[in-house]
Amino acid sequence: LQDPCSNCPAGTFCDNNRNQICSPCPPNSFSSAGGQRTCDICRQCKGVFRTRKECSSTSNAECDCTPGFHCLGAGCSMCEQDCKQGQELTKKGCKDCCFGTFNDQKRGICRPWTNCSLDGKSVLVNGTKERDVVCGPSPTDFSPGTPSTTMPVPGGEPGHTSH
């Protein structure tokens, strides 16, 4: 026997208390599929969340984050504070990347510079807090007697102390 509720379209609910008639979802609620016995409560984008898409009778609201924050989690379930490039977010706020690490984004953690020597290459451009090192050709790529450019010696940034 067919369930009478299966005829209720998205945007309605099948009323348990009224002989299973299809009724529209009330304000601030929705049903995204047909045959639902209850309507879901609309998400509210409050505080640091911003409304990206309004709730309708058939779909939930979608949120993003106010400027200075970025989304985390499925469906932007959290907003996390942005930091500057060259920093990472800690419990105490934004902190500069430690020497030997970098972050080229406003989010995420500082990652170690690439170790060029592991691939048998040399450092072409030194790393900074904001940028990874750039590896160049390996020193053995230069045949004796061939003019070559001297590679910069790997070294730290002046004044940037390890912490």
Partner: antibody, heavy 122, light 112 residues
Framework: QSVEESGGRLVTPGTPLTLTCTVS????????MTWVRQAPGKGLEYIGI??????TYYASWAKGRFTISKTSSTTLELKITSPTTEDTAIYFC??????????????????WGPGTLVTVSS | AAVLTQTPSPVSAAVGGTVTISCQAS????????LSWFQKKPGQPPKLLIY???SLASGVPSRFKGSGSGTQFTLTISDLESDDAATYYC????????????FGGGTEVVVK
Amino acid sequence: QSVEESGGRLVTPGTPLTLTCTVSGFSLSDYYMTWVRQAPGKGLEYIGIMSGSGSTYYASWAKGRFTISKTSSTTLELKITSPTTEDTAIYFCARDGDYAGWGYATGAFDPWGPGTLVTVSS
Amino acid sequence: AAVLTQTPSPVSAAVGGTVTISCQASQSVVGNSLLSWFQKKPGQPPKLLIYSASSLASGVPSRFKGSGSGTQFTLTISDLESDDAATYYCTGRYNSDTDTFVFGGGTEVVVK
């Protein structure tokens, strides 16, 4: 139509605990269900609700501390992720009857289970 | 989040008398009417008395009457019986995906 909670016991702080709410005479897909607790000497405190389709909504203080999930058409769970002594209480599960036909949770919580006691102590 | 403030506890009256418990909300409940009243006795689960501000729940005597709208609600118990000694709670429904429901602090009714 009835509701019954189980799983309450003595746990040490930080030990996750899952409570179960078993319903009979109706399906969880047809109603909103709520979890409410009462600490010793305190009033009733709303924890959260789950819709018929399985969407969950929590009190702001309960977010991250509790997880409501449906394991079958007749069993609902409440997980206390990292209990503290403040979570010592009787935990109740109740159906939202929606007798006025709104189509969502209205606060007409009925029936209720007898409750299950959770004691958090070191 | 909204706050529901109930009449200071306890409220006492004699058998056969009338008590009135108020529930004041800091914000209007959904539809100005989604407020329920519960009776709670020690060792027992809460019992639904009134839903949608004034609708009497099934099996509840008509001595219990709910009224009010928006932010101000009242539960009146007339012809008081000794069995009515309990703590009474109001709960409001709010248009929010967090703190969807808020309970009042409770009002103890003492029957003399």
